[in-house]
Amino acid sequence: PGPPAGSPRVSSDPRADLDSAVLLTRSLLADTRQLAAQMRDKFPADGDHNLDSLPTLAMSAGTLGSLQLPGVLTRLRVDLMSYFRHVQWLRRAAGPSLKTLEPELGALQARLERLLRRLQLLMSRLALPQAAPDQPAVPLGPPASAWGSIRAAHAILGGLHLTLDWAVRGLLLLKTRL
């Protein structure tokens, strides 16, 4: 080995990664809120929609105080990976009615991927356990009808909105513990 020499700082550190994850999550939440509103305008929803393959909401307001860094990041990454795959599926399977939202769905998918990269980098830098993201519990086949894909879009955007909402709160809380 050569003589002891310092290394230059790389682009970010774990606390900066967490700040970046908060900003990305907030930005993604705003995008999702806007897209969900567009969906409601174009295709009014008759009540709440859900998909069996979507993850259940990880946190409630009451559990925020007891959050632990590893659990939040692992769960958030696994859930967001599921939503990423669902958005991918929606873009592939969407009928002509949803094609008008393709640019927005594409941008949403790209931002989700960026957030997932950032979360994984944060987990690597902290050396936290990284569970392999599961495939969706229910295989995603083509929607039964055009209305089926619209209902699926409502469910995916609604679930993602709730997930990102608790993610912002959870990540902000974790900032104080790192």
């Epitope: 310092g6 290394s7 700082r9 790389v10 550190d13 774990p14 606390r15 590893p70 990976m81 997932l116 990269r117 994984q120 980098l121 690597s124 830098r125 902290l126 050396a127 936290l128 356990p129 990284q130 569970a131 392999a132 993201p133 790192l178």
Partner: antibody, heavy 114, light 111 residues
Framework: EVQLLESGGGLVQPGGSLRLSCAAS????????MHWVRQAPGKGLEWVAV????????YYADSVKGRFTISRDNSKNTLYLQMNSLRAEDTAVYYC???????WGQGTLVTVSS | QSVLTQPPSASGTPGQRVTISCSGS?????????VHWYQQLPGTAPKLLIY???ERPSGVPDRFSGSKSGTSASLAISGLRSEDEADYYC???????????FGGGTKLTVL
């Protein structure tokens, strides 16, 4: 500037023990997971062990499980590797590394030989 | 035997573009885990060259780039220089080992 300085290497007989230390400076040590990675003479890199930023998670390569113990003292900005039941095949330069790993020390040579 | 597979050697002439591959499996690169690349100059410690598949730490020239697809990744070096002669290693987290794994390394020779 980030500095990771390993110490504690040397010549030890098979079956013996050594404790490696790594003193860190220039970054927030307590915010980084820390690794030990080794490199046998003329060979490639082999990950040995990792400890999470707060010490709550520790993982080991199968080749050292049950013989090596990784630990850290965030108040002293120091990482440790306790190596017991050493074998000839443990002979290598041992690097301390932080993060992804983003930063690497210059390494300390451990020679296991009779 | 390394968990990630790299060609043992690669070569090119100054100014050329060379690519080094890194092949993994469903428990590491194929499981959506990021790939990182390290450069080890003769007699020195490894240095982070690319992280998160394609991001460069500050100070690394843009001649170095990374990409990932499926269970494989690659490092590309354009405008090859004599100072690029080194060993290059890929690394990724492996869920079955609960830790990072390295490729066997690729010795790059600038002819």
């Amino acid at each position: 500037e980030v500095q990771l300085l390993e110490s504690g290497g040397g010549l030890v007989q098979p079956g013996g023990s050594l404790r490696l230390s790594c003193a860190a400076s220039g970054f927030t040590f307590s915010s980084y997971g820390m690794h030990w990675v080794r490199q046998a003479p003329g060979k490639g890199l082999e990950w040995v062990a990792v400890i999470s930023y707060d010490g709550s998670y520790k993982y080991y390569a199968d080749s050292v499980k049950g013989r090596f113990t990784i630990s850290r003292d965030n108040s002293k900005n120091t990482l440790y590797l306790q190596m017991n039941s050493l074998r000839a095949e443990d002979t290598a330069v041992y690097y301390c590394a932080a993060g992804v790993p983003d930063y690497w020390g210059q390494g300390t040579l451990v020679t296991v030989s009779s | 035997q390394s968990v990630l597979t790299q060609p043992p050697s690669a070569s090119g002439t100054p100014g050329q573009r060379v690519t080094i591959s890194c092949s993994g499996s469903s428990s590491n690169i194929g499981s959506d885990y990021d790939v990182h690349w390290y450069q080890q100059l003769p007699g020195t410690a490894p240095k982070l060259l690319i992280y998160s598949n394609n991001e460069r730490p500050s100070g690394v020239p843009d001649r170095f780039s990374g990409s990932k697809s499926g269970t494989s990744a690659s490092l590309a070096i354009s405008g090859l220089r004599s100072e690029d002669e080194a060993d290059y290693y890929c690394a990724a987290w492996d869920s079955s080992l609960s830790g990072p794994v390295f490729g066997g390394g690729t010795k790059l020779t600038v002819l």
